[in-house]
């Protein structure tokens, strides 16, 4: 008789990511009877909701539900029916929602009921919809990228299963950007964390762990660009806004009433003689980066030192891993790669932002041209906040990895988010037999 | 704009493939899924299926598995429908389109031209 | 698969009168999409996500119903709305269309 292949014992989690630009579903699978291993839990799919973020739907809530329906159409495809009723479902919500909320509580909630109301039609075990604070927001990034790379297992290796390894137990630092918000989190060497809202602490399998972490709101790429252009058109003589920020020979008119729309921007809001304004791209990235300079306050700093608006920020410490857009901006500058210097970067940089507009449309045919129009000033933001936001050195940079994926997951949040509400990190190292899950983070 | 521009009409033999294209414009060509329509005798529309230009997925309805290929080439902005062992019944206009929300969540819904495809001895 | 079927197949209103297509779904459906063709053109998108008229769109049209029911109404016809109208579901793969009704003018 023929042996037949017994089912696969697994289980599935879906955690959907409601960004400030886009919202991503991930599906993640692991082996049931292996749950409290480090490093099991593995990504098999991405669905990108097609369509901005959820807080766009602010006017339109009803048609949420039409928003996420082909990924979660897909996730109905991918886990089998059999396992779809004990699939936990979860969406965190970030910086886009969090300035939906300082804007208006109300109107925040109206979002997140729909979201509930829709993600509740399917078969799943849907288990809630919030926005996640930036401080998790961090320390969910860190778990991920250390989860994945294998920080968390006692047993050492002498052979190195995933890039970046350095085998040894050292964990590495995570550095996420998004649209609306960054966040450096990591495990000073023996520093006092001086500041309590920065300092989190873990005991993950058995070791206990002091983290370091902020969330700078208002300071990923998409954000900062609405500060930067309120901030410049504060000055500017006429409605006419030469930036260095865009191509030469770029054009673009934009609403000062969409420039003001945004929580981000409320420091610079001031009474304009006119309702639009036109920027006009010179392509100068020396003088960019001056410009976003001016949006970082280093002048003031009640701790022994600060990244910038006075949050404190610890001596740099290991290897950090760079992911979400870091890692998008610069794969589509091509400067991913880890022997290219700091120096080479900038060199690059300035190249780039210095190309004619017509001729970078025609060089990148098939992207938007509102996405292509920023990678100048994307990457002369990334460098910025790197080197004089977060004290990176040009010696240092060598130890920044940009990475998208580890061992095939995303870097990123929703894992960690996942595993630590499945309960599946243990804070004691597990035996044999899985413990009891009473003493989970 | 978005727009979708679809090659021209064919003329093919029982038992024979063709390759349909579609060229898309004015949008980030990752950003939505692309899907593919059929339309016999001027009437009927029935749904071929789709690919996600940002991971490759494909979906197929099941009545044309094994009928219809789809691919991308990024490079281009361009998606392709290969259908094989023609017959008569594959006679038809075949549609791309694609739909969703863009950047300020207003939902729009565009189609190519039509490719009519005709399988004749 | 979700089946969806309209009726009637054919209709021949007078100006000015009212219209409404019916679309019935074999199973619940969230949302109903409706297009109108005319011959030799695509199909184009008329009212989206059961109620809500896309670009362009007479204020003469609305959209109603709700779960397997659901239907498209024309407030006065006018001669420019002769054509077949198509409802379709993004519920659930695969998506589907109703087989049209087609609308001429008595």
């Known amino acids: 008789t023929q042996n037949k292949a017994l089912p696969e014992n697994v289980k599935y989690g879906i955690v959907l990511d409601a960004g400030s630009s886009h919202t991503s579903l991930y599906i993640y699978k692991w082996p049931a009877e292996k749950e409290n291993d480090t490093g099991v839990v593995h990504q098999v799919e991405e669905c990108r909701v097609k369509g901005p973020g959820i807080s766009k739907f602010v006017q339109k809530v009803n048609e949420i539900g039409i928003y996420l329906t082909d990924c979660m159409e897909r996730a109905r495809e991918v886990i089998p029916r059999s396992q779809h009723q004990e699939t936990p479902v979860y969406l965190g919500a970030t910086a886009g929602m969090r300035l939906l909320r300082m804007e208006s509580e109300e109107l925040a909630d109206r979002v997140l009921d729909v979201v509930e109301r829709s993600l509740s039609n399917y078969p799943f075990d849907f288990q809630g919809a919030r926005i996640i604070t930036g401080q998790e927001e961090g320390a969910y990034g860190w778990i991920t990228i250390n989860y994945l790379l294998g920080k968390f297992s006692q047993k050492t290796r002498w052979f190195s299963i995933v890039p970046y390894e350095t085998n040894n137990q050292e964990t590495f630092g995570a550095l996420d950007l998004g649209g609306a918000s960054t966040q450096v989190t990591f495990v000073p060497q023996n520093q006092t964390i001086e500041s309590p809202d920065n300092a989190l602490q873990f005991r993950l399998y058995g070791k206990d762990y002091n983290v370091y972490t902020h969330s700078f709101l208002c300071y990923g790429k998409d954000q900062a660009l609405w500060q930067k252009l309120a901030k410049d058109i504060q000055v500017a003589s006429n409605e006419i806004l030469r930036d260095p920020c865009f191509h030469p020979g770029y054009k673009k008119v934009v609403n000062v009433s969409d420039l003001y729309k945004t929580p981000c921007t409320k420091r610079f809001e001031m009474t304009l003689p006119f309702q639009q304004f036109e920027i006009q791209g010179i392509g100068n990235y020396q003088q960019c980066h001056q410009s976003i300079l001016e949006l970082f306050n280093t002048s003031y700093c009640p701790y022994s030192q600060c990244a910038f608006n006075g949050i404190f920020l610890p001596p740099l410490q290991g290897d950090f891993g760079a992911f979400s857009a870091f890692y998008f901006v610069m794969k589509f500058l091509n400067l991913t790669s880890e022997k290219v210097s700091q120096e080479k970067v900038t060199e690059m940089m300035k190249k780039f932002c210095a190309q004619p507009w017509e001729e970078i449309k025609t060089s990148y045919a098939g992207v938007k041209e509102k996405y292509l129009s920023e990678y100048c000033f994307s990457g002369t933001y990334i460098l910025s906040l790197l080197l004089q936001g977060y004290h990176f050195t040009a010696d240092s940079w060598e130890h920044i990895h940009f990475i998208g994926k580890i061992q095939g997951s995303d870097a990123g949040w929703t894992l960690g988010y996942m595993l630590n509400l499945t309960n599946m990190i243990p804070a004691e190292q597990p035996l044999s037999t899985p413990l009891s899950h009473s003493t989970y983070v | 704009e978005v727009q979708l521009q679809q090659s021209g009409p064919e003329l093919e033999k029982p038992g024979a493939s063709v390759k349909i294209s579609c060229k898309v414009s004015?949008?980030?060509?990752?950003?939505?899924?692309l899907n593919w329509v059929k339309q016999y005798n001027g009437k009927n529309l029935e749904w071929i299926g789709n690919?996600?230009?940002?991971?490759?997925?494909?979906r197929y309805n099941q009545k044309f598995k094994g009928k219809a290929t789809l691919t991308i080439d990024q490079s281009s902005s361009t998606a392709y429908m290969h259908l094989k062992s023609l017959t008569s019944e594959d006679s038809a206009v075949y549609y791309c389109?694609?739909?969703?929300?863009?950047?300020?969540?207003?939902?729009?819904?565009?189609w190519g031209q039509g490719t009519t495809l005709t399988v004749s001895s | 698969e979700i089946v969806l079927t309209q009726s009637p197949a054919i209709m021949s209103p007078s100006p000015g009168e009212k219209v409404t297509i019916a679309c019935s779904a074999s199973?619940?459906?969230?949302?109903m999409h409706w297009f109108q063709q005319k011959p030799g053109t695509s199909p184009k998108l008329w009212i989206y996500?059961?109620?809500n008229l896309a670009s362009g769109v007479p204020a003469r049209f609305s959209g109603s119903g709700s779960g397997t029911s659901y239907s498209l109404t024309i407030s006065r016809m006018e001669a420019e709305d002769v054509a077949t109208y198509y409802c379709?579901?993004?519920?659930?793969?695969?998506?589907?269309f109703g087989a049209g009704t087609k609308l001429e003018l008595k």
């Open positions: 389109g694609l739909y969703g929300y863009d950047d300020d969540a207003n939902y729009f819904d565009d």
């Open positions: 004015g949008y980030s060509f990752t950003d939505y899924n």
């Open positions: 690919i996600d230009p940002y991971s490759g997925g494909t």
């Open positions: 199973s619940s459906v969230s949302y």
């Open positions: 996500a059961t109620s």
């Open positions: 379709q579901q993004r519920s659930s793969y695969p998506l589907t």
